[in-house]
Interface confidence: medium
Amino acid sequence: ESGYAQNGDLEDAELDDYSFSCYSQLEVNGSQHSLTCAFEDPDVNTTNLEFEICGALVEVKCLNFRKLQEIYFIETKKFLLIGKSNICVKVGEKSLTCKKIDLTTIVKPEAPFDLSVIYREGANDFVVTFNTSHLQKKYVKVLMHDVAYRQEKDENKWTHVNLSSTKLTLLQRKLQPAAMYEIKVRSIPDHYFKGFWSEWSPSYYFRTPEINNSSGEMD
């Protein structure tokens, strides 16, 4: 999957570990796709290092990445989206390491947005809704979402719920009364495309009602 420079070439460079990882985002800007790569070792000296992608492209053989601080980035319409591309780290014309990657298997969706929680007093529940830009996309339409919520005081005690829709109901009796909760959501491809979790949406905070002593229910 990866090949290093031959002995005698770039002796200094050979001492470094040029392992890298990438993710793609399809139709991230209208019909434009993006591909982002970064070295796994944050201490790699990236001076003079370039990334190049070849194969499974439309109209061109290869494309060069732009460098943005420590990440390497392409935005283009030219991904064929069938077949594997060869992504290489290069110094000049010499490849230091390469990976064959199908861009449809490293898709990172855009983060969900407009997360909100509405309390329904009559139903004694909370309706969680959020939005995703992927509903309008041609390619990565089907996602699985991970809704995570916690009581604000329980720093690492997150409860996770997986769902394919953008609406979730939380029963009031499952939550602590008179408590502040934090909730957030992320997405991952769930049909044909494969890849990684999106970034988390911005968190939403909501308070549960107090218990009504006469009925034993929350206010």
């Epitope: 194969g55 499974a56 492209l57 439309v58 109209e59 064929l80 069938i82 077949g83 199908d102 298997t105």
Partner: antibody, heavy 121, light 109 residues
Framework: EVQLVESGGGLVQPGRSLRLSCAAS????????MHWVRQAPGKGLEWVSG????????GYADSVKGRFTIFRDNAKNSLYLQMNSLRAEDTALYYC??????????????WGQGTTVTVSS | AIQLTQSPSSLSASVGDRVTITCAAS??????LAWYQQKPGKAPKLLIY???SLESGVPSRFSGSGSGTDFTLTISSLQPEDFATYYC???????????FGQGTRLEIK
Amino acid sequence: EVQLVESGGGLVQPGRSLRLSCAASGFTFDDHAMHWVRQAPGKGLEWVSGISWNSRGIGYADSVKGRFTIFRDNAKNSLYLQMNSLRAEDTALYYCAKDEYSRGYYVLDVWGQGTTVTVSS
Amino acid sequence: AIQLTQSPSSLSASVGDRVTITCAASQGISSALAWYQQKPGKAPKLLIYDASSLESGVPSRFSGSGSGTDFTLTISSLQPEDFATYYCQQFNSYPLWITFGQGTRLEIK
């Protein structure tokens, strides 16, 4: 040496089934989409079906859709075409072809020598 | 589906002649076109990809040009081994689909 060898052709009655195989060697099979292309006697080339390297992208010509199934076994470096409900018009020389998308587009850069399918009663 | 129409369907020419075969797509396909040569009893052979890129090992007398809907295969100086049938081919990636032209038969005059 890059090589594709088709097998499984023969004489079959209309309505019956046949399975073609293509054994690949000399290249990394699971890096490439693969295709079946046929040529009826004295006629031109007709694309039949194609399958992406991981079997997630599959396409068929309208003339065979619903009757033919393409599949592959990357562990065995093999491509297959299951042909059901065969018709007289399916009579042809069937080629297996390797796809070289690194050329920028689907292009069929290596072909087998073909296997003959004759559908007749 | 996109149709490819080759012209002429057949032509006669002599060794040393310059020959041009055209392929017209029913809608724009950028440069997503390849050319193949097929000799009787043999499998097709890739000549040109990306409309104008010469496949490795193919003689430089073969060249391709065009973009969008109109494409051309040119043989600058016919050799005896060039008498064959030539096909253009295009592809679509979603859904996976390949189309061939109907072929042009090049015969010795």
